[in-house]
Interface confidence: low
Amino acid sequence: IPVIEPSVPELVVKPGATVTLRCVGNGSVEWDGPPSPHWTLYSDGSSSILSTNNATFQNTGTYRCTEPGDPLGGSAAIHLYVKDPARPWNVLAQEVVVFEDQDALLPCLLTDPVLEAGVSLVRVRGRPLMRHTNYSFSPWHGFTIHRAKFIQSQDYQCSALMGGRKVMSISIRLKVQKVIPGPPALTLVPAELVRIRGEAAQIVCSASSVDVNFDVFLQHNNTKLAIPQQSDFHNNRYQKVLTLNLDQVDFQHAGNYSCVASNVQGKHSTSMFFRVVESAYLNLSSEQNLIQEVTVGEGLNLKVMVEAYPGLQGFNWTYLGPFSDHQPEPKLANATTKDTYRHTFTLSLPRLKPSEAGRYSFLARNPGGWRALTFELTLRYPPEVSVIWTFINGSGTLLCAASGYPQPNVTWLQCSGHTDRCDEAQVLQVWDDPYPEVLSQEPFHKVTVQSLLTVETLEHNQTYECRAHNSVGSGSWAFIPISAGAHTHPPDEFLFTP
């Protein structure tokens, strides 16, 4: 590391004095300091001498000596004060440019360290600093305005108290430039537009930036439109707005509209599509199947997508039967808007009851007329089973009725002993009835089937069980012949309550 003689951090001299600063290093050394007159420089290899015979206030500053060949890049410094009673300040630059939120150094160097206690920073013509101006002072470097703001772009003077009066420096102009983060921000309204031929339309393209230097234009398909520009400044941003007003739209106005803005940082663009139609339209659709099957007690959301222009004048969900005359609760109907012309309407049917099976219709109306979309909702039920003993054409017959949806399959089991339910070990015989007789099969209702098992003689120490199953579940009924007649057992667990 080079060494400076005199080996003091600060040196205070009077105007006109001779000052000699000597720097010695291992290799060649170089001086660096404020640009000022009257210095002469002598070098002889490993030492360098900076000297003046007539020091002035302009020689005030920090002089640094470096050794270019030093890999550690070490340096030494000495600060020189030339204390001129008439000149308390040495201003190194009269214009300082920084970006917003950077620290701005106003380089007015104090020529006499004794004056430090009475220094202040003011705006020209003695005006006070703006509120919230946060600054600090260093006698070696000057005033620093911390995190400078655009609004602090002003002319400043450094003030020192000398003999009871304030002595000002020459002025320093601070320019705080806005940081332009990127191309201007854009909005194009609306994001999508539909109009009937002959209607009026408006498209607004606006761009904003922290800096006033940017351009904006609106183009239709690939043609730049000549539209007067409105300019504004608010929220610390410059705004430029282009408004396209069309009194009576026609098909040639349809197409792609792009809003484009550019500045030194680059270009932004956003687009929208304008559709011109001959007349009002209203389209209903659903991603769901219009025929729905749901297990009783479960929930279902019916969802309808609506595309319409002009907007809907009315809409509702209606239950068309065939059961009760109840109507869907309004609180279960939910409407969401995907965008201006597309909406989704949802009917929530939680914990479906038997009386809620049937047809649900969504109706909507706009100036284009009425449209309806109807869902058919069938409920699935696990089978319910009952068995009776009867005589048909003189033959003893077990008659099993099973009711559920989808249509239940029927299986008969004969097993040893008296039991509520045949288990595998007890089973003597199994008969599948592939074609049970359908007794009733109305839309939205359970399907009831009947299966007959002709039994010549009932074995009294045996159980006859009818089992029915479908995709939802199963049910069974055990028939136990006893000497005093017949005895039937629905299994205890089969108490079906939807």
Epitope: E287, N334, T336, T337, K338, T344, T346
Partner: antibody, heavy 120, light 112 residues
Framework: EVQLVESGGGLVKPGGSLRLSCAAS????????MNWVRQAPGKGLEWVSS????????YYADSVKGRFTISRDNAKNSLFLQMNSLRAEDTAVYYC?????????????WGQGTLVTVSS | DIVMTQSPLSLPVTPGEPASISCRSS???????????LDWYLQKPGQSPQLLIY???NRASGVPDRFSGSGSGTDFTLRISRVEAEDVGVYYC?????????FGQGTKLEIK
């Protein structure tokens, strides 16, 4: 039945990474926004991140911004949370929750949660 | 960020008695569409949270009608008309008006 099942939690060292997954079933996954919420041991609920149905809009809590990435695969009915540069304070049970259809955002249902422990 | 403040933080209740929990937001949760973007959740011991009330007053599917929500703007209340043993847990309010979505600190309901 609507179901959400989280996976991918575990023990990881500070600075490490983990990828959480949430498998959805029983509903049209591509129609709903999805969310991650976490709960540090013995503490309350903290929203972590949300992603819209088509992944066009993504939001993060400040505490995870720049470290966590939410994503989804609508074809596979899956939601993900890639967690990088993990810290001890990220230790929590992470829940995935279905959001509403736009513009409603209530969280229903929630998964059972997966525990993430960040410790050296 | 919108700050959600719940009170009380602990709520001992006798079964069959009513209970109410207050939730206050640092700014209005009323959207221009007329809805308050305030939801209530219950986290039972050892379980995941479950939705109770959405958009300030709408009961979620399967939630008993003894639960009700009310309020508008910045002040909201969850009421339980008759507390049952199965209602124990931590109740949270949450705003979804704007991100970051924020929860209240939670109110622990206990049976006396």
């Amino acid at each position: 039945e609507v179901q959400l099942v989280e996976s991918g939690g575990g023990l990881v060292k500070p600075g490490g990474s983990l990828r959480l997954s949430c498998a959805a079933s029983g509903f049209t996954f591509s129609s709903y926004s999805m969310n991650w919420v976490r709960q540090a041991p013995g503490k309350g609920l903290e929203w972590v991140s949300s992603i819209s149905s088509s992944s066009s809009y993504i939001y993060y809590a400040d505490s995870v911004k720049g470290r966590f990435t939410i994503s989804r695969d609508n074809a596979k009915n899956s939601l993900f949370l890639q967690m990088n540069s993990l810290r001890a304070e990220d230790t929590a049970v992470y829940y995935c929750a279905r959001g509403g259809s736009f513009p409603y955002n209530w969280f229903d249902p929630w998964g059972q949660g997966t525990l993430v422990t960040v410790s050296s | 960020d919108i700050v959600m403040t719940q009170s009380p933080l602990s709520l001992p209740v006798t079964p069959g008695e009513p209970a109410s929990i207050s939730c206050r937001s640092s700014q209005s949760l009323l959207h221009s569409n007329g809805y308050n973007y305030l939801d209530w959740y219950l986290q039972k011991p050892g379980q995941s949270p479950q939705l109770l009330i959405y958009l300030d007053s709408n009961r979620a599917s399967g939630v008993p009608d003894r639960f009700s929500g009310s309020g508008s703007g910045t002040d909201f209340t969850l009421r339980i008309s008759r507390v049952e043993a199965e209602d124990v847990g931590v109740y949270y309010c949450m705003q979804t008006l704007q991100t970051p979505y924020t929860f209240g600190q939670g109110t622990k309901l206990e049976i006396k």
